[in-house]
Interface confidence: low
């Protein structure tokens, strides 16, 4: 016997209180697949999050981060503070890269300069906090 709920399309839910009639998802909720018995609450992009895509009856809202922050985690579950090039984010905020390390992005951590001598090369251009060394012949 076919489950009557399987006929309910995305954007609706199978309402047990109304003889398993397919009812539209209430405001601020959605169902992205058919045959669902409940609609999921829409994600709200608050605070440091901003709305990239509004919630519809068939798809959840999508968030990104306000300027000065970048997304972290699946589906932008967190916003992480941007730092300047030449810095890394620590639990005390942005800190300059230590000597011998660099970061050429606004996110991520400082990485050691390339050791040119490992490849039998010499340093052509010295490294900075923002840039790796350039190795030469």
């Amino acid at each position: 016997l076919q489950d009557p709920c399987s006929n309910c399309p995305a954007g609706t839910f199978c309402d047990n209180n109304r003889n398993q009639i397919c009812s539209p998802c209430p405001p601020n909720s959605f169902s992205s697949a058919g045959g669902q018995r409940t609609c999921d609450i829409c994600r709200q992009c608050k605070g440091v999050f901003r709305t990239r895509k509004e919630c519809s009856s068939t798809s959840n809202a999508e968030c990104d981060c306000t300027p000065g922050f970048h997304c972290l985690g699946a589906g932008c579950s967190m916003c992480e503070q941007d730092c300047k090039q030449g810095q890394e984010l620590t639990k005390k905020g942005c800190k300059d890269c230590c000597f011998g390390t660099f970061n050429d992005q606004k996110r991520g951590i400082c990485r050691p300069w390339t050791n040119c001598s490992l490849d039998g090369k010499s340093v052509l251009v010295n490294g900075t906090k923002e840039r790796d060394v350039v190795c030469g012949p």
Epitope: A74, E80, E88, L89, T90, K91, K92, K95
Partner: antibody, heavy 118, light 108 residues
């Protein structure tokens, strides 16, 4: 060789005070953040407080905020933890650790035991 | 506060076996900020892994770390007698700094 040596622990009554010290050697003390981490008998590790290289920025766990004060004297290569209004739940081994911020705590002292009991 | 939950609480294994320890965060943590420590009775903790997967100085290559987001793993490929200890994960992504409750690796 990096060494951290804590001292100042002991038995103190509830409501009392104690000042822990951590003498550092083998590295440029004034260049590093430092932290205190404690461990109650038979329990896990709990971060207590940290301080930046200049001593201007400090942070505390909620459980000790307003009662404990972290400080440092870079001329003496020494880290301190002033503990006031001590409670039974502050009983623990207190470790000082060099704090690499993003990269965790790479060197630890041997710990000093603080017992708060009447 | 980011809560780190370690599992299992105790792992009973024999020398030579593989140990897999889990650390789950209550919210996403950049892998750069996740560390693992080993602690033996009466001793201070020792840093094993930082940045979720980088071995600290002097740590043998049988120790490896992996993971991202909310799920992190410490693997000991072949347990040596000196590896039986308690292991803690720790995050320094945001205040307060937090540790997991620990996993004890004991001899079976």
């Amino acid at each position: 060789e990096v060494q951290l040596l804590e001292s100042g622990g002991g038995l103190v009554q509830p409501g009392g005070s104690l000042r822990l010290s951590c003498a550092a050697s083998g590295f440029t003390f004034s260049s590093y953040d430092m932290s205190w981490v404690r461990q109650a008998p038979g329990k896990g590790l709990e971060w207590v407080s940290d301080i930046d290289p200049t001593g201007s920025k400090t942070d505390y766990a909620d459980s000790v905020k307003g009662r404990f004060t972290i400080s440092r004297d870079n001329s003496k290569n020494t880290l301190y933890l002033q503990m006031n209004s001590l409670r039974a739940e502050d009983t623990a081994v207190y470790y000082c650790a060099r704090d690499l911020m993003v990269y965790g705590f790479d060197y630890w002292g041997q710990g000093t035991l603080v017992t708060v009991s009447s | 506060e980011i809560v780190l939950t370690q599992s299992p609480g105790t792992l009973s294994l024999s020398p030579g076996e593989r140990a897999t320890l889990s650390c789950r965060a209550s919210q996403s943590v950049s892998s750069s900020y996740l560390a693992w420590y080993q602690q033996k009775p009466g001793q201070a903790p020792r840093l094993l892994i930082y940045g979720a997967s980088s071995r600290a100085t002097g740590i043998p290559d049988r120790f490896s770390g992996s993971g991202s987001g909310t799920d992190f793993t410490l693997t000991i490929s072949r347990l040596e007698p000196e590896d039986f200890a308690v292991y803690y994960c720790q995050q320094s992504y945001s205040y307060p700094v937090t540790f997991g409750q620990g996993t004890k690796v004991e001899i079976k």
